[in-house]
């Protein structure tokens, strides 16, 4: 549903302000309106209405611009103004605020605790197979495997600090280049960004919502897709990033300092190693080919050993393999030599859930990324609630005027960099971009944050990510320190040079355009989001990497011809949008496709078709949650059910069962299907899949 | 008192097969490597065969491999080698001799007095 | 293979003599080296181990030294019981070996 838009500025222009066949207006509350239309699109309509529900000052006082379903939305204020409150209700207004303010720590508290969980969840389902990815030699060779492989590694263990440690690892024992490495940390970077995606989607229930929050968390994904699209070719043809990075790192002679400060991990900690400790190592020794790690579990069972340093016998298959002459002995049987080897005795269990429960990695993961996504859905959806009883009126204004507006003229360049540091900083502290980026989402969702506000949040973030990668490197042991550093350094540039490419100039700012696109799409059909997020992080890599299995040839093959139709299809949109008539009248549009290969509407039937048995259980789920929740917060108000569930429930509401009760910010009467279409919701096509 | 006592030796055909034993007394026989070390009339000592302390390990010189077995019984502290295939340059006095512990260099510090094994047609 | 070559192969000494025999390895050994006494019809006995420590209940006139190749047994003075045929066996490698003997007789 698309909100009020928020009042801004008075403009000049009165037209905007006036009904014509080519504006698009809401459908307001009472009144319908008359909307002019033509067969002929060459003739100018010269037919106008005043809008009836506006008086003309008003509208000139504050223009309503409510074609845009990205403008955000006005979250007004119900309650009763401070000045009218007694002192009874002035106190317990600031008990309330307090109240809310602590219940919103404590979410977003668990909200991040709930996130690391799930990168631990994500390492025990797919930790080691990921590792055996690393130990694939054609890496070595092949750039655009190294580029899957970082993908899908850091997906699968939705750590991009943990792919890195192995890369820094396998670099540093020389298993791999750092030539070689500088793709899979290109990988690591798009896939980080899944997880702020995932977050999105747990806002699927509210379309402009939605809207918003996904676009907001694919601008992400965009921004490091077209990078990696730029700077993977220039780095292979040039290797700038490796000649780069090995200046910086052979001028300075650094000396490995301390380790890099925990901050939001100082408060995470306690809480997540009560639910599950994972050894990490597991995962760069499977990497490295240890092949007796393959066999060890990643959760933790021993939190305190004591490690010995004793001289041993030990035996050895040969004479060649003795530490000194004088050390190798026989005692007639074996031979034995005098090794210094590391006693390690298990003195105290760790403390957590599943330290005595003995289950496989597998069982544990399962269980803990069910757990950990329900604590995350559920989170978001009260830290979503309290903001949006929090933020509305005065509150809301301040903070949207604080966040979104920019610096006056002429220094309004610089408002977007300074978002770019506040990114970065805000990143260090919480030491990880998905928990930041994760965050944003609801702030964009709910609209107190614009994306064009959140893109240089987000590009800081990338940025905080890697300053945090360079500490940690600088504080790694002698052994490791040179690799390290180069390969924090690489993803440092590499940041650099993707903001470089797509945010200084704002034509050049794509990734945002693209984010709304797909944020229009998804917002019409939610069954595309869940697709685009299989399709991009999954099958996309695993095809390629798939191919680049089979060899160059097979790659090359499949792909050119690919890429070739990709940029045809391109090159093909562009003309039709810029200048169609260049184009044979067949080409101006996609009309000479099949409907399925030009529209989303026929495999939107197909999903609604499978999801459609499952529809009705899960609104009579929601709705007894709903009926709970509203009962425990005493507000009759507080809870809401998808669209979906609306009109499913229709023909119920005579039988006095509870439907959506909209909340104040919501426009009821408008239901924006994408980007530039009003029109009264038809129940039937609306309710989709998700 | 650590003695060794060696028997079972006897002339044998070539291809035949013999089994000598070594009975020990006076030392915790499960504790420690044992060997069989054998010697041609006028020549040298040269070393045939080794067990580990729990039978688990074994040794066998390359000119008797595949056809002599080493074992032992540790509850009743003896020792057997199993010739088979005998030839006549496996002609000799053969020895039980104790080892140290496991993991311990070679050192043969207690003898039995032998056992000869005659090999011909 | 590690071959231990003893030399004399045969001496002849008088009581009272200081006697040296000296036990080359084919490669370094370390100090893995022990010395033997047989006396004809009888069954081997332990001197020295390891290069140099001195076997329990053997008289402290057998004194072992040496390391990596080359290796001595010396006895500082000549008893009549002491007429025997020494071995040198190196317990560095599999398999053991034992040097081909010297038999030290009355002059």
């Known amino acids: 549903m698309a909100p009020w838009p928020e009042l801004g500025d008075a403009q000049p222009n009165p037209s905007k302000y006036l009904e014509g066949a080519t504006s698009q207006q809401p459908i307001t509350p009472d009144k319908s309106k008359e909307t002019n239309k033509t067969d002929n699109t060459e003739v100018p309509v010269t037919k106008f209405e005043l809008l009836p529900t506006y008086s003309t000052a008003t509208l000139i006082e504050e223009p309503t611009e409510v074609d845009d379903p990205w403008n955000l939305p006005t979250l007004q204020d119900s309650g009763i103004k401070w000045s009218e409150r007694d002192a009874k209700g002035k106190i317990l207004c600031v008990f309330q605020g307090i109240g809310r303010l602590i219940l919103l720590l404590g979410f977003l508290y668990f909200f991040v605790c709930s996130l690391d969980v799930l990168s631990s969840a994500f390492q025990l389902v797919g930790g080691k197979m990921a590792g055996q990815f690393f130990s694939n030699s054609s890496i070595m060779s092949n750039p655009l495997l190294g580029l899957v492989i970082g993908v899908l590694v850091t997906v699968f263990v939705q750590s991009s600090s943990t792919s890195t440690s192995i890369v820094v690892s396998m670099v540093a024992s020389s298993l791999l280049t750092v030539r070689a490495a500088i793709p899979i940390i290109m990988g690591a970077n798009i896939g980080t960004s899944i997880t702020n995606t995932i977050v999105a989607l747990m806002q699927v229930g509210d379309r402009s919502e939605f809207r918003r929050a996904f676009a907001g968390a694919t601008v992400h994904d965009f921004f490091n897709w077209l990078s990696v699209l730029v700077l993977l070719p220039v780095e292979v043809a040039t290797h700038y990033l490796e000649v780069v990075t090995q200046l910086i790192v052979e001028s300075f002679h650094f000396k490995n300092g301390e380790d890099a400060p925990d901050l939001l991990k100082v408060i995470t900690k306690p809480f997540t190693k009560l639910i599950v400790q994972l050894d990490k190592k597991v995962i760069s020794q499977i990497a490295m080919n240890d092949e007796t790690a393959k066999n060890k579990s990643l959760v933790k069972i021993w939190c305190k050993t004591f490690t010995n340093m004793t001289q041993m016998n030990v035996t050895v298959p040969s004479m060649a393999n003795c530490t000194s002459h004088s050390l190798c002995w026989t005692d007639g049987i074996q031979i034995w030599t005098m090794k210094n080897v590391t006693y390690k005795e298990n003195i105290a269990k760790c403390q957590h859930i599943f330290v005595n429960f003995h289950l496989p990695d597998l069982a544990v993961g399962i269980i803990l990324l069910i757990i950990s996504l329900l604590v995350l859905c559920g989170c978001l959806i009260m830290i979503v609630k309290i903001l949006g009883s929090v933020l509305k009126g005065q509150v809301a204004t301040v903070i949207k005027k604080t966040i979104n507006t920019d610096f006056p003229f002429p220094f309004a360049w610089l408002t977007g960099y300074l978002a770019i540091l506040v990114g970065a900083g805000m990143t260090f502290i919480v030491q990880s971009s998905s928990v930041f980026t994760s965050a944003l989402t609801p702030l964009i969702g709910i609209g107190v944050i614009t994306i064009e506000r959140a893109y240089p949040l987000t590009l800081g973030s990338n940025i905080g990510t890697t300053t945090t990668a360079i500490l940690a490197a600088l504080a790694s042991p002698g052994n490791t320190l040179r690799s390290s550093l180069q390969i924090a350094l690489c993803h440092f540039f590499f940041n650099i040079s993707g903001i470089l490419l797509w945010y200084p100039i704002p034509f050049t700012r794509l990734p945002i355009r693209m984010a709304k696109g797909l944020g229009n799409i998804s917002a019409k059909y939610r069954w595309f989001a869940v697709f685009y997020l299989i399709i991009f992080f999954f099958l996309i890599p695993l095809t390629v990497f798939g191919l680049s299995l089979a060899g160059w040839p097979v790659l090359v093959g499949v792909g050119v011809p690919v890429v070739f139709i990709i940029i045809l299809v391109l090159c093909l949109r562009l003309l039709q949008s810029r200048c169609p008539r260049v184009l044979p009248k067949k080409l101006q549009n996609w009309n000479f496709l099949p409907l399925c290969m030009h529209s989303l509407k026929p495999w939107d039937a197909v999903i609604s078709k499978f999801t459609g048995p499952f529809q009705m259980p899960c609104c009579c789920c929601c709705r007894v949650c709903c009926r709970v929740c509203c009962l425990l917060c005493g507000c009759p108000k507080c809870c809401r059910c998808s669209k979906c569930c609306q009109d499913l429930e229709e023909g119920q509401e005579a039988q006095g069962v509870p439907v959506k009760a909209p909340e104040t910010f919501d426009n009821i009467t408008i239901s924006r299907e994408a980007q530039g279409e009003v029109r009264a919701p038809d129940s039937k096509t609306e309710c989709t899949a998700l | 008192e650590v003695q060794l006592v060696e028997s079972g030796g006897g002339w044998v055909q070539p291809g035949g097969s013999l089994r000598l034993s070594c009975a020990a007394s006076g030392f915790t026989f499960s504790s420690h490597i044992m060997y069989w070390v054998r010697q041609a009339p006028g020549k040298g000592l040269e070393y045939v065969s080794g067990?580990?302390?729990?039978?688990?390990?074994?040794y066998y010189v390359d000119s008797v491999k595949g056809r002599f077995t080493i074992s032992r019984d540790n509850s009743k502290n003896l020792l057997y080698v199993h010739m088979g295939s005998l030839k006549p340059e496996d002609m000799a006095m053969y020895y039980c001799a104790r080892g140290g512990r496991d993991r311990v260099p070679a050192v043969f510090d207690y003898w039995g007095q032998g056992t000869l094994v005659t090999v011909s047609s | 293979d590690i071959q231990m070559t003893q030399s004399p192969s045969s001496l002849s000494a008088s009581i009272g003599d200081r006697v040296t025999i000296t036990c080359r390895a084919s490669?370094?050994?370390?100090?893995?080296l022990n010395w033997y006494q047989q006396k004809p019809g009888k069954a081997p006995k332990v001197l020295i181990y390891?290069?140099?420590s001195l076997q329990s209940g053997v008289p402290s006139r057998f004194i072992g030294s040496g390391s990596g190749t080359d290796f001595t047994l010396t006895i500082s003075s000549l008893q009549p019981e002491d007429f025997a045929t020494y071995y040198c066996?190196?317990?560095?490698?599999?398999?053991?070996?034992f040097g081909q003997g010297t038999r030290l007789e009355i002059k």
């Open positions: 067990i580990s302390s729990n039978g688990l390990s074994s």
């Open positions: 066996q190196q317990s560095y490698s599999v398999p053991i070996t």
């Open positions: 390891v290069a140099s």
């Open positions: 490669q370094s050994i370390g100090t893995f």
